[in-house]
């Protein structure tokens, strides 16, 4: 099993990690859904965006998110490995000028309007932990992942190896 200390050892210095270049290595639009195939949707309410996790009606269009992928370099002394490693970080933007942010104090995931360069709270380390699912780990808070709680996105602390493949932090990306 994936020892959480392994993740934290590798990502302890995420806050100081250097993202290679300012431009993403690739970008594309995809819909985001949970392991249980609920859709992540975004609604404008009172001039701010709310994020929901819900079952869509048949033929209802899925919201798309622009995923921007960045390479991050990590020195070997942080990873515990013998050589420098690379990680893939992602930012998620469901609409122009708005990005998903990790609010570590409130343990919440929020949409904030901001300009580039984006703050560290907008970057997430991308993991393939389970089959064709991905997980998003906070750059600013190693061991904390975007997850689903009470039909909303929240930040979930993963404190043991058994929880790293838990369904509520697994997401599917689809371009259709």
């Amino acid at each position: 099993a994936f020892g959480i200390s392994g993740v934290q050892k590798y990502t302890r210095a995420l806050h100081d990690s250097s993202i290679t270049g300012i431009s993403p290595i690739t970008e594309y639009l995809a819909s985001l859904s949970t392991y249980n195939d609920q859709s992540i949707t975004f609604a404008l309410e009172d001039e701010s965006y709310e994020i929901y996790v819900e079952d869509l009606k048949k033929d209802e269009k899925k919201d798309k998110v622009l995923l921007s992928y960045y390479e991050s370099q990590h020195p070997s002394n942080e990873s515990g490995d013998g050589v420098d490693g690379k990680m893939l970080m992602v930012t998620l933007s469901p609409t122009k000028d708005f990005w998903l942010h990790a609010n570590n104090k409130e343990h919440s995931v929020e949409l904030h309007k901001c300009e580039k360069p984006l703050p560290d709270q907008a970057f997430f380390v991308l993991h393939n932990m389970h089959s064709n699912c991905v997980s998003f780990e906070c750059k600013t808070d190693p061991g904390v992942f975007i997850g689903v709680k009470d039909n909303h996105l929240a930040l979930i602390k993963v404190d043991s190896s058994e929880n790293l493949c838990t369904e509520n932090i697994l997401f599917k990306l689809s371009e259709t």
């Epitope: 392994g6 990873s79 690379k86 990680m87 893939l88 393939n128 389970h130 089959s131 064709n132 190896s161």
Partner: antibody, heavy 121, light 107 residues
Framework: QVQLQESGPGLVKPSETLSLTCTVS????????VHWVRLPPGKGLEWLGV???????DYNSALMSRLTISKDNSKSQVSLKLSSVTAADTAVYYC???????????????WGQGTLVTVSS | DIQMTQSPSSLSASVGDRVTITCLAS??????LAWYQQKPGKSPKLLIY???RLADGVPSRFSGSGSGTDFTLTISSLQPEDFATYYC?????????FGQGTKVEIK
């Protein structure tokens, strides 16, 4: 530096189980996924499966019922077991490491030298 | 499973030629495609990842392009050491399938 080394018997009898070990150094199996790929004589590369940093495995659909990939993080070893082998399983078997920490999107820049396994009685 | 179709299956070219190999995915794979070079008796070598990114230590005469379902590997000026078999691999969804390979031979 990153190294991967495959080991195991070079000859396996039909209907038996092929067992190979990939011993790695220069990185931790808790940080990177490891893939198994084979090259049958006169054919192209065939992806067999992956064991991810988190410990879950995914397999080639055609081999799923016969294939098991597991690992021992503390020994830095990944094992492949392929049951009920036939002559069609004769190939050079490679293990390879993911480019990116805890994700497979970047392909595999690090490979073992490969080991030839012949299935014959 | 996602099928990867490479073309041509083989080609003959001369040193200095511009060589293009294409790879077609049976469904969208975004840009999660890798290209490998393999020589007889040797392990595969990663050339390109994420469709367009040059792997460490790979000469700049190699380049990759494409996204979605159509991808191309280009060798701008073929060198003697480039005669080998080239494979594409999709890493979008498991099982991570390879193309059938393109053998580049000396004309």
């Amino acid at each position: 530096q990153v190294q991967l080394q495959e080991s195991g018997p070079g000859l396996v009898k039909p209907s038996e189980t092929l067992s190979l070990t990939c011993t790695v150094s220069g990185f931790s199996l808790t940080n990177y996924g490891v893939h198994w790929v084979r090259l049958p004589p006169g054919k192209g590369l065939e992806w067999l499966g992956v064991i991810r940093a988190g410990g879950s495995s995914d397999y080639n659909s055609a081999l799923m019922s016969r294939l098991t990939i597991s690992k021992d993080n503390s020994k830095s070893q990944v094992s492949l077991k392929l049951s009920s082998v036939t002559a069609a399983d004769t190939a050079v078997y490679y293990c390879a490491r993911d480019h990116y920490f805890s994700n497979s999107y970047g392909g595999s820049p690090y490979w073992g030298q490969g080991t030839l396994v012949t299935v014959s009685s | 499973d996602i099928q990867m179709t490479q073309s041509p299956s083989s080609l003959s070219a001369s040193v200095g030629d511009r060589v293009t190999i294409t790879c077609l995915a049976s469904q969208t794979i975004a840009t999660w495609l890798a290209w490998y070079q393999q020589k007889p008796g040797k392990s595969p070598k990663l050339l390109i990842y994420a469709a367009t990114r040059l792997a460490d230590g790979v000469p700049s005469r190699f380049s990759g392009s494409g996204s979605g379902t159509d991808f191309t590997l280009t060798i701008s000026s073929l060198q003697p050491e480039d005669f080998a078999t080239y494979y594409c691999q999709q890493l979008y969804n498991t099982p991570y399938t390879f193309g059938q390979g393109t053998k580049v031979e000396i004309k």
